[in-house]
Interface confidence: low
């Protein structure tokens, strides 16, 4: 996850160890049936478990294990590089029976001048170079091949694209004598897609370009370009869709204005304005045409770029995103929150909710957190009783049925899920808040009290009477 955080989500459980599962013995022909389960209703969890168990039982005599890991492939075209000139790459786990491909763009902030890129290279080198990347990665959350952890798309071909361009996946400039660093985020995506066509992507039915944080913004910036690329290369039948997690930022007024000295404190508009020039950043063509030259920075903000996109995009965004609060200079440390800051935070949630009003496919819980889709517990959070995997399944169905002219939402299968309660953690399924310094789980009631909410407001959704809450707090708990 990105940047400096004051409150952290509950520690992620380690992914389960890879299971010993039967697979076809080497050299045997494998007959694959590209089934499409998009429109399956009912209990998806048990259905998927049954399907997987059936698939496994087809090869009872094999000794080979099914590997759950994604394997590293550095780009064959070594001119498409990370910041330091090392080749970019991707991690892949193929699922030969599936015509679904999930390409995930990693996040990790950005740097926008020589000084803060040098500092980033010293402290976060794996986000600027492929030299020390591990040979394999375990797929978690939406990248997991376990139906228990990923009831949505466990059977898809999984691709994790590490972020090593520091440019919000927008850059198109190579390393030279003049440029100490290469910024090739947009080109890396294009090259990965090109190489994957030779590894089975050519037979895909659906390509879902997903990403978290800077990767989520990267989805908004690149999804139409990927669709256009596939069309030009002769694959117009591949449906390209986007899933942008925690990358829908507001160019709002900071709580306290600070000069643009580093990545974290620089106002997002100013950071992106400077970044675009430094990276030779590219934005979606239809969005670029809406703004004057020099104003392309606008296209990095979801609510401005989204209406110009042609591909369907599902937006996932915490209403109180930690990265948003960080760039707005909100640091919830030490002293209890003043009234002005409490109102600022509440207003942020309100503004974000407003920007999602016309985004038909969206999932926005009223939580203070950052990123969700590759967390092992991504299935836990609900909005109005619907989990994110369920909402994504409903989205798939709505797109599957969209050729039937009907624009009415599917009964009992919602895709627009935005919390309406107005303060952080008023949704009972929010991830636990943790204190950055002690790592201890914070009592949500205490956390909200610290943020200046009145007793009744805080006590109710936590399942406490105000008197009980007072007692708990006065007992020093």
């Amino acid at each position: 996850s990105e940047g400096r955080k004051t409150w952290r989500r509950r520690g992620q459980q380690p992914p389960p160890p890879p299971r010993t599962e039967a697979a076809p013995a080497a050299g045997q022909p494998v007959e694959s049936f590209p089934l499409d389960f998009t429109a399956v209703e009912g209990n998806m969890d048990s259905f998927m478990a049954q399907v997987k168990s059936l698939a496994q039982s087809l090869y009872p005599c094999s000794a080979q294990q099914l590997n759950e890991d994604l394997r590293l492939h550095l780009l064959l075209n070594t001119s498409v590089t990370c910041n330091d000139g090392s080749p970019a790459g991707y991690y892949l786990k193929e699922s030969r029976g599936s015509r679904r491909w999930l390409l995930f763009l990693e996040g990790g902030w950005y740097c926008f001048n020589r000084e803060n890129c040098d500092s980033r290279y010293d402290t976060m080198r794996r986000l600027m170079s492929s030299r020390d990347w591990p040979r394999t990665r375990t797929g978690t959350g939406i990248l997991s091949s376990q139906p228990e952890e990923n009831p949505y798309w466990w059977n898809a071909n999984m691709v994790f694209i590490p972020y090593c361009s520091s440019d919000v996946w927008s850059g198109a400039s190579s390393k030279s004598e003049k440029n100490e660093y290469a910024f090739m985020g947009a080109l890396i995506i294009q090259e990965v897609v090109r190489e994957l066509l030779g590894r089975g992507l050519s037979g895909a039915k659906v390509l879902l370009l997903a990403g978290s944080a800077a990767g989520g913004t990267g989805v908004l910036l690149n999804v139409d370009r990927v669709a256009e690329q596939l069309e030009k290369l002769g694959y117009p039948a591949i449906q390209v869709r986007g899933l942008a997690d925690s990358g829908w930022f507001l160019d709002n007024k900071q709580y306290r204005h600070t000069d643009c000295v580093d990545t974290i404190t620089c106002a997002p508009t100013e950071a992106i304005r400077r970044g675009i020039r430094y990276w030779n950043g590219v934005v979606p063509e239809r969005c670029r045409r809406q703004f004057q030259e020099g104003e392309e920075w606008n296209c990095f903000f979801g609510y401005k770029v989204y209406p110009t996109l042609r591909c369907p995009v599902f937006v996932v965004q915490w209403l109180f995103d930690e990265a948003q609060l960080t760039v707005d200079n909100v640091h919830l440390t030490g002293q209890p929150v003043q009234e002005g800051l409490r109102l600022y935070i509440q207003n942020l949630g309100r503004e974000l909710r407003h920007t999602l009003k016309d985004v038909p496919a969206s999932f926005a819980p009223a939580c203070l957190s950052h990123e969700i889709i590759i967390r092992s517990h991504w299935t836990d959070v609900q909005v109005k009783g619907t989990s994110l995997p369920r909402a994504l399944h409903c989205w798939d169905r709505s797109l599957h049925d969209s050729h039937k002219a009907s624009k009415t939402p599917l009964k009992g299968c919602p895709v627009h899920l935005v919390d309406s309660c107005p303060w952080p953690h008023c949704n009972p399924s929010c991830p636990t808040v943790r204190d950055q310094f002690t790592g201890q789980e914070m009592n949500v009631a205490q956390f909200l009290m610290h943020m200046g909410f009145d007793m009744q407001t805080v006590a109710q959704p936590q399942g406490l009477e105000p008197s009980e809450l007072l007692g708990m707090l006065s007992n020093g708990s």
Epitope: V381, G385, C421, S429, G463, E465
Partner: antibody, heavy 119, light 111 residues
Framework: EVQLVESGGDLVKPGGSLKLSCAAS????????MHWLRQAPEKGLEWVAY????????SYANTMKGRFTISRDNAKKTLSLQMTSLRSEDTAIYYC????????????WGTGTTVTVSS | DIVLTQSPASLVVSLGQRATISCRAS??????????MHWYQQKPGQPPKLLIY???NLESGVPARFSGSGSGTDFTLNIHPVEEGDATTYYC?????????FGSGTKLEIK
């Protein structure tokens, strides 16, 4: 496999003391609030006590306040319930249960340990 | 404390038919669009097992024959179609305020 196993149940005289333990495995114990609940013979379920993940919040049923103490050791993945001044009405199967952080329900239960208070 | 009144205390249902169990709270257990009511099944000699959480959400691994509904003070657990193995006791529980409390249980028999 996610598991909770209670131990320490015994036959004890009224006014006596007993310490119950609950060993957790298969999940990150330190992430979860934990509860003790009980069920008297042929009766319904009754909540006993709660402890938050970092032991910052402790809460007890009214009839057990002052007599029972809930504690945990996250490093050892154990939950404890120290019971004193036991009464015959404390006779029950005692269960430890994990509180799901999505709204206060009990998503994992132990198999239970039997406490009998009788002279 | 919030009192949960479960009804009926016992219920006889034919195999394959629908079983409906009610739970009424002495005050609302809903807040901000969420209902803090949960349902458990308990077989003799075993601990309770979570079936439904937050009023209507099916716990992972629980058959879709089980469903929950309701908000405010009135909640329902439905089992349809009923199977032999469903013959046991069911409890509702709220987590709206401390202490959490349980209903007195409903014993389901299959004929």
């Amino acid at each position: 496999e996610v598991q909770l196993v209670e131990s320490g149940g015994d036959l004890v005289k009224p006014g006596g003391s007993l310490k119950l333990s609950c060993a957790a495995s298969g999940f990150t114990f330190s992430d979860y609030g934990m509860h003790w609940l009980r069920q008297a013979p042929e009766k319904g379920l009754e909540w006993v006590a709660y402890i938050s993940s970092g032991s910052t919040t402790l809460s007890y049923a009214n009839t057990m306040k002052g007599r029972f103490t809930i504690s945990r050791d996250n490093a050892k993945k154990t939950l404890s319930l120290q019971m004193t001044s036991l009464r015959s009405e404390d006779t029950a199967i005692y269960y430890c249960a994990r509180k799901n952080y999505n709204g206060g329900y009990f998503d994992v239960w132990g198999t239970g340990t039997t406490v009998t208070v009788s002279s | 404390d919030i009192v949960l009144t479960q009804s009926p205390a016992s219920l006889v249902v034919s195999l394959g038919q629908r079983a409906t169990i009610s739970c009424r709270a002495s005050k609302s257990v809903s807040e901000s669009g969420y209902s803090y009511m949960h349902w458990y099944q308990q077989k003799p000699g075993q601990p309770p097992k979570l079936l439904i959480y937050l009023a209507s959400n099916l716990e992972s691994g629980v058959p879709a024959r089980f469903s929950g509904s309701g908000s405010g003070t009135d909640f329902t657990l439905n089992i349809h179609p009923v199977e032999e193995g469903d013959a046991t006791t069911y409890y509702c529980q709220h987590s709206r305020v401390l202490p959490p409390t349980f209903g007195s249980g409903t014993k389901l028999e299959i004929k």
